[in-house]
């Protein structure tokens, strides 16, 4: 349902759903320029907006555009549809809440009087309400029963900060110290699971926060307990260092699993595998890229692009890679739809030079690059070796890989195998005599 999509998108982008809308029902053949012009004509007179993304929706076989508004949705002026190519396009917004209007009017009135929502809450006996949230544009808390027993949400002891980077910045804690404080404070908080989770996320930065966001995107009802378990699994010391690396090396896509879904599943395992290893961000990115190339069946176009990045030594970071893969998946969806529409005619992107190049490169012979292990420069033999890695970085940074050196290792190349075929080989297995197999020496990058 479009509304669910809007809500999910807002959650994923940490956006106020009252400042967002979705335009659905955009014909597949609509170009970006046509979309931009139509949206501009329909929305520009109302308020400033930003287009944050486009996607293909299978259920209505059309494109959708996600838009952030400069102001909260004005239900009186916002059209339910805008005229566009192929008919009218539906404008999806969060349903109007009758209380919102009252609260926003009350807010303006109080501002004129030099008062705030906090004063109202005190007058009503809601002394437990969080000061900072009371003066927001709309305060859902005010709707709760006015005479609840005081909660600890007004003033609460904030958690220390944990980022999951190998060398914590000033003001950040080690995982053990952070976890100790969380375990101590959590039981004291007499608040809802949602609020607990919000406070937990508030204390996270960098890779730790990225991982939580990924987990939340996959399961928005994830509990605080589950969040902590995931963090313990990744950053805790319980599992043997090598075991986590082996687990990462063993991970292959499931039958029919999309590349983007596999990447989401792989990321926490990669972060755990590289945690505490003296490696650069760029090396983590290189490992991720090489693992995908070795293990995943993908379209020649995507493989061509990823191999180009690999050859150039410019591995994308997690978010960049995800964007690239999702773009490609969307493109494939679009292409499939167009093919269904017009059947044998037309040369899709399949005939392009880019794809031809990509196809040529899939079967290209493997280049063997010498790599060093973590602590030792002598190469050793292992099946399915990975490049070594150094300190990890924020996954959400706006910068792309910014030039640290990275070690490399040979990765067996995954031919464009049919979905469901296990990677080229599981780590430690014999390579069969199929195409692409061959005896090869891999450095042992994980060895310490």
């Amino acid at each position: 349902m479009a509304l669910t999509l809007l809500e999910d998108w807002c959650k994923g982008m940490d956006m106020d759903p009252r400042k967002a809308l979705l335009i659905v029902g955009i014909p597949m053949e609509c170009s970006e320029v046509e979309i931009q012009d139509t949206v501009k004509a329909g929305l520009q007179p109302l308020c400033a907006y930003r287009v944050l993304g486009r996607m293909f929706r299978r259920e209505d076989n059309a494109k959708a555009v996600f838009i952030e508004l400069a102001d909260t949705v004005n239900y009186t002026t916002l059209p339910s549809h805008i005229p566009g190519k192929g008919g009218s396009w539906e404008v999806v917004v969060k349903p109007r809440n009758p209380d919102d209007e009252f609260l926003s009017r009350l807010n303006y009135f109080l501002k004129d009087e030099g008062r705030s929502m906090t004063d109202v809450a005190r007058a009503l006996g809601c002394c437990s309400l969080p000061a900072e949230s009371l003066d927001a544009e709309v305060m859902p808390q005010v709707r709760s029963p006015p005479l609840e027993p005081p909660k600890e949400s007004m003033w609460y002891r904030k958690l220390k900060v944990f980022s999951g980077t190998a060398s914590p910045s000033p003001g950040e804690e080690t995982f053990e110290d952070w976890l100790e404080q969380v375990t101590e404070i959590m039981p004291i908080w007499q608040v809802s699971e949602v609020e607990k989770r919000r406070r937990l996320l508030e204390s996270l930065r960098g890779p730790a926060l990225s991982i939580m966001r990924v987990l939340q995107a996959n399961n928005d009802s994830i509990t605080v307990e589950q969040c902590l378990d995931a963090l313990k699994q990744i950053f805790g010391d319980k599992e043997d260092f090598r075991a986590s690396q082996f687990r990462f090396l063993q991970t292959s896509p499931k039958i029919g699993e999309k590349v983007s879904t596999f990447l989401l599943r792989l990321e926490p395992l990669l972060q755990k595998a590289v945690h505490k290893s003296p490696l650069s961000v760029r090396s983590t990115d290189m490992i991720r890229l090489k693992h995908l190339l070795a293990r995943v069946a993908m379209t020649p176009a995507l493989r061509g692009k990823l191999e180009l990045l690999d050859q150039r030594g410019c591995p994308p970071n997690f978010l960049e890679l995800m964007k690239l893969i999702r773009d490609e998946e969307e493109w494939e969806n679009t292409e499939a739809v167009m093919k269904n529409k017009e059947k044998p005619s037309g040369r899709g992107r399949g005939a392009s030079g880019r794809q031809a190049r990509a196809e040529a490169s899939v079967s290209a012979p493997q280049a063997t690059v010498q790599a060093r292990s973590f602590s030792d420069s002598s190469p050793q033999t292992i099946q399915g070796g990975l490049p070594p890695l150094v300190k990890r970085r924020r996954l959400l940074g706006s910068e792309s890989t910014r030039g640290e050196d990275h070690g490399q290792a040979t990765y067996p190349k995954a031919e464009n195998q049919t979905p469901g075929r296990e990677g080229p080989q599981a780590a430690g297995e014999e390579l069969g005599n199929e195409a692409g197999a061959g005896a090869m020496s891999h450095p042992k990058p994980w060895e310490t």
Partner: antibody
């Protein structure tokens, strides 16, 4: 480190077409959007337009009728063509990496050093 | 199009001064604003995005604030490297990306 380098003639005759190329190194052109921005001598900045690796473009309406931006992913390059130039198009032309669609904003985080193009007969 | 107006056009200050530059948008743009610094003969350099987020590697003496139509860039203690021209840029999709006309910070 991502680096951008503009190249092309520094002198163009009025009514002709200005052509510039931007070469991206240290990163793939296939992930971000890429923009052209210009700055007439002693004046402010003007955004010309952007392109994505797929070929999607968006141009400033004030220049739309005269501008074409194209991309060559195999060379990690994108190009600008501005037709029917006049002296008013004399400017330093910059190429830049564009974060269009990023939740944090559509800004320019890496720039080329710029190339001065003079329109004169 | 959304117009961006910066003030002042020129500002004379000394090393160590606290400097504030204002940028006003012709319509509400939430926090969709970036600030750049440009020194003569060089390309602009991103300082701030989303009105108040500091770009990595930019000294913490630079800060941005504001939302809606009024925005400010503040340099808490002016350093010799900071004498330059500063531009604001809005990024609403409802208008082409537009820049302010610039504010030149010069030595008093």
């Amino acid at each position: 480190q991502v680096q951008l380098q503009e190249s092309g003639p520094g002198l163009v005759k009025p009514s002709e077409t200005l052509s510039l190329t931007c070469t991206v190194s240290g990163g793939s052109i296939s992930i971000y959007y890429w923009s052209w921005i210009r700055q007439p001598p002693g004046k402010g900045l003007e955004w010309i337009g952007y392109i994505y690796y797929s070929g999607s473009t968006n141009y400033n309406p004030s220049l739309k009728s005269r501008v074409t931006i194209s991309v060559d992913t195999s060379k990690n390059q994108f190009s600008l063509k501005l037709r029917s130039v006049t002296a008013a198009d004399t400017a330093v032309y910059y190429c830049a990496r564009d974060t269009y669609g990023d939740p944090r904003g559509d800004y320019f985080d890496y720039w080329g050093q710029g190339t001065l193009v003079t329109v004169s007969s | 199009d959304i117009q961006m107006t910066q003030s002042p056009s020129t500002l004379s200050a000394s090393v160590g001064d606290r400097v504030t530059i204002t940028c006003r948008a012709s319509q509400r743009i939430s926090n969709w604003l970036a600030w750049y610094q440009q020194t003569p003969g060089k390309a602009p350099k991103l300082l701030i995005y989303k009105a108040s987020s500091l770009e990595s590697g930019v000294p913490s003496r630079f800060s941005g604030s504001g939302s809606g139509t009024e925005f400010t860039l503040t340099i808490s203690s002016l350093q010799p490297d900071d004498f330059a021209t500063y531009y604001c840029q809005q990024y609403s999709s409802s208008s082409p990306r537009t820049f302010g006309q610039g504010t030149k910070v010069e030595i008093k």
